[in-house]
Interface confidence: low
Amino acid sequence: YPYDVPDYASGGGGGLEHNTTVFQGVAGQSLQVSCPYDSMKHWGRRKAWCRQLGEKGPCQRVVSTHNLWLLSFLRRWNGSTAITDDTLGGTLTITLRNLQPHDAGLYQCQSLHGSEADTLRKVLVEVLADPLDHRDAGDLWFPGESESFEDAHVEHSISRSLLEGEIPFPPTSILLLLACIFLIKILAASALWAAAWHGQKPGTHPPSELDCGHDPGYQLQTLPGLRDTDYKDDDDK
């Protein structure tokens, strides 16, 4: 998790509504960016990761979470950038795979509602040089289109690299979903067993003692054939 340096070590004057957190990664490796947020305030909202060409300019969408908010925990890819949202834990995670020097720049984590977007966190991605830099195609800014970032209050952070093929621990929402489904199955099986044992007709279900955290968003009946596969961000290009 990123750590913050004291104020005196961070960038000059404020002026920005949101502080900017710096995530540093090594070229050629993966960088994981986390954006914490208030899960209640942003309940039901999709999230997005965008790249900002200028401090005051619009933010260009890179990738967004699944169209169905319930499935936000599924990782979606656009090129080498992935996004996944732990909606209960309140953490948006973006993975930049095979980080390159030209991936450096200013980004935003956003919470979407209608045609509007709230900024969850401003992120400055810094890429530390790798001696085995192959100089391949990737991203660059337009210098003519950019404005100075001198006003940014920067909280320097180091992000742990996610190794290729490493599976991150499942977010809270996935674990809770699985637990709910598992317990519902047990309750249903118990009810059927009890009904058969007592010779009753299994037409009604007993009231469930588990409400899965009172979150209507997770009251799924079944998820047939659903796998935690990668989703490409086709609709937000």
């Epitope: 030209h102 660059l140 210098p143 950019s146 100075s148 290009k237």
Partner: antibody, heavy 122, light 113 residues
């Protein structure tokens, strides 16, 4: 596959006007800055101007050498780019190219059309 | 406007030789915010349109053979072809994309002996 195809060139008299078109396909047109470049025979290319993408309100930039005479526009419903050229001069004779800037390529022109010849002569 | 001085104007080499083309700009093309140089190299074969080889001074465009290398920073840039092939016969242009109007070098014509 990214494709850019120019049309509308030909012969025009000095002082006349001409409108060039560029049909784009194979990419999300509204996401990209689009450019016009010309190249007189045997000379280096000359950047004429660009029109920005949706995120930047389709605003334009021009080379001072043609500003006021040339106008760049786009029809995003048809994925078309246009160059309106007025008060043409003999020195405007060249091959005209439309080209795409991938925003992620630092302003460089990653795809070009085949070009269309414009001859300004009486 | 930023002026680009490209040299040499022409080169005659044998297949397999190493070639270097130089571009010097009238002001620095290094943009401090992104720590990148905004210079591109294009190859234009006879009767064809220019094709992007290198962007950001040193990044090879997709599909460009690795015998093409871009280097340099600030005001001095170089395109190197490590071992010239017959299909490399073309004009080579550099272009600055640091500020408007974008400007091209005069070009280098590469010919084979």
């Amino acid at each position: 596959e990214v494709k850019l195809l120019e049309s509308g060139g030909g012969l025009v008299q000095p002082g006349g006007s001409m409108r060039l078109s560029c049909a784009a396909s194979g990419f999300t047109f509204t996401d990209f800055y689009m450019n016009w470049i010309r190249q007189p025979a045997g000379k280096a290319p000359e950047w004429l101007g660009l029109i920005r993408n949706k995120a930047y309100g389709y605003t334009t930039e021009y080379n001072p050498s043609v500003k006021g005479r040339f106008t760049i526009s786009r029809d995003n419903t048809q994925d078309m780019l246009y160059l309106q050229m007025n008060t043409l001069r003999a020195e405007d004779t060249a091959t005209y190219y439309c080209a795409r800037i991938g925003i992620n390529y630092g302003g460089s022109l990653d795809y070009w059309g085949q070009g269309v010849m414009v001859t300004v002569s009486s | 406007d930023i002026l680009i001085n490209q040299s040499p104007a022409s080169l005659t080499v044998s297949a397999g030789e190493k070639v270097t083309v130089s571009c010097k700009s009238s002001q620095s093309l290094l943009y401090s915010e992104s720590n990148q140089d905004y210079l591109a190299w294009y190859q234009q074969k006879p009767g064809q349109f220019p094709k992007l080889l290198i962007y950001g001074a040193s990044y090879r465009h997709t599909g460009v053979p690795d015998r093409f290398t871009g280097s340099g920073s600030g005001t001095d840039f170089t395109l190197t072809i490590s071992s010239v092939q017959a299909e490399d016969l073309a004009h080579y242009y550099c272009e600055q994309t640091y500020s408007y109007p974008y400007t091209f070098g005069a070009g280098t014509k590469l010919e084979l002996k």
